[in-house]
């Protein structure tokens, strides 16, 4: 399955919007910095086929979408930027979803992919717990915004590598 050219443009737009969403200086939140243990090994593109990479990317974007779709998120960010960001993620989900279905059809997830999906889920669990513990403070959201920019960059790079493989 070839992801449409608009998909990579959407990736870049999502990153730009997320950058624009920053409200406070990252430097004023240094005390709140946290290592969320992003599962980089799941995004290096070497250990599994394109089909499996796409379902891990889907999980990544789906969890990001869910994270920014909460009431707490709505209260934290400028509404029009948040809506545009969510729209970009939603479109990416549509593209990835179509690819997962087209590549393999609806079937059981390959065993080696299961742990990759769980690793992404656990990563977002750590982010969710961090926000809860910090009571969704502005600095906590700023730390999370910077973290998601990093993880989306990894996703974008993996998608570039997948296109080169084609």
């Amino acid at each position: 399955c070839d992801l449409p050219q608009t998909h990579s443009l959407g990736n870049r737009r999502a990153l730009i919007l997320l950058a624009q969403m920053g409200r406070i200086s990252h430097f004023s939140c240094l005390k709140d910095r946290h290592d969320f243990g992003f599962p980089e090994e799941e995004f290096d593109g070497h250990q599994f086929q394109k089909t499996q990479a796409i379902s891990v990317l889907h999980e990544m974007i789906q969890q990001t979408f869910n994270l920014f779709s909460t009431e707490d998120s709505s209260a934290a960010w400028e509404q029009s930027l948040l809506e545009k960001f969510s729209t970009e993620l939603y479109q990416q989900l549509n593209d990835l979803e179509a690819c997962v279905i087209q590549e393999v059809g609806v079937e059981e997830t390959p065993l080696m992919n299961v742990d990759s999906i769980l690793a992404v889920r656990k990563y977002f669990q750590r982010i969710t717990l961090y926000l809860t513990e910090k009571k969704y403070s502005p600095c906590a959201w700023e730390v999370v915004r910077a973290e998601i920019m990093r993880s989306l960059s990894f996703s974008t790079n993996l998608q570039k590598r997948l296109r080169r493989k084609d």
């Epitope: 889907h58 279905i101 769980l118 969710t128």
Partner: antibody, heavy 119, light 108 residues
Framework: QVQLVQSGAEVKKPGASVKVSCKAS????????MHWVRQAPGQGLEWMGE????????IYAQKFQGRVTMTRDTSTSTVYMELSSLRSEDTAVYYC????????????WGQGTLVTVSS | EIVLTQSPATLSLSPGERATLSCSAG???????LYWYQQKPGQAPRLLIY???NLASGIPARFSGSGSGTDFTLTISSLEPEDFAVYYC?????????FGQGTKLEIK
């Protein structure tokens, strides 16, 4: 509010199949994995597997592999769990439970569907 | 598969007493993915505690959770009549996800 409504009780003969449905409402159906958990009479809870309603991919517990099939219908926001080659030990209440993260993990459950396997 | 063993199987106490329920894992579980559920007869399970020690929405402060690695505890500081039920620990740290066999908390 989030609601999961399951189909009614079923009585099946050994060797037959059963298909239980779980209709979701109150949230964006495609965004959360749906899980199936069963409970035999007087026994504990047992995780069977999960399905991503967005693209339909599934993850099954090895114990049920080859006998369980989870599917979804996005047009009706419904997930299905089909269990084949039924035996008496499959007599149980079958629950759907919505995934999520933090306080949302299995925070929402269906009311349960009793499946009785008897000759 | 991570086996969760709960003890005791049955706990007989009176209202007002303190209840301590244990959950022991066959191998290490990330505390973020250890949960507790309460179940009453004829009802679906209800989320009590998430990520070892966090109270779910609407759960009274008399419930608390602690632990790490392979040993986890659910404590009810002063039992109320409505607390008598079956309690399950649950992990989603690795596939397949598993539940303990349950601890039945009954009125003495």
């Amino acid at each position: 509010q989030v609601q999961l409504v399951q189909s009614g009780a079923e009585v099946k003969k050994p060797g037959a199949s059963v298909k239980v449905s779980c209709k979701a409402s109150g949230y964006t159906f495609r965004n959360y994995w749906m899980h199936w958990v069963r409970q035999a009479p007087g026994q504990g809870l047992e995780w069977m597997g999960e399905i991503n309603p967005s693209h339909g991919r599934t993850i099954y517990a090895q114990k049920f592999q080859g006998r369980v099939t989870m599917t979804r219908d996005t047009s009706t926001s419904t997930v299905y769990m089909e269990l084949s080659s039924l035996r008496s030990e499959d007599t149980a209440v079958y629950y759907c439970a919505r995934g999520g993260l933090g306080p949302a993990w299995f925070a929402y459950w269906g009311q349960g569907t009793l499946v009785t396997v008897s000759s | 598969e991570i086996v969760l063993t709960q003890s005791p199987a049955t706990l007989s106490l009176s209202p007002g007493e303190r209840a301590t329920l244990s959950c022991s894992a066959g191998s290490s579980v990330d505390s973020s993915e250890l949960y507790w559920y309460q179940q009453k007869p004829g009802q679906a399970p209800r989320l009590l505690i998430y990520s070892t020690s966090n109270l779910a929405s609407g759960i009274p402060a008399r419930f608390s959770g602690s632990g790490s690695g392979t040993d986890f505890t659910l404590t009810i500081s002063s039992l109320e009549p409505e607390d008598f039920a079956v309690y399950y620990c649950h992990q989603w740290s690795s596939y397949p996800f598993t539940f303990g066999q349950g601890t039945k908390l009954e009125i003495k």
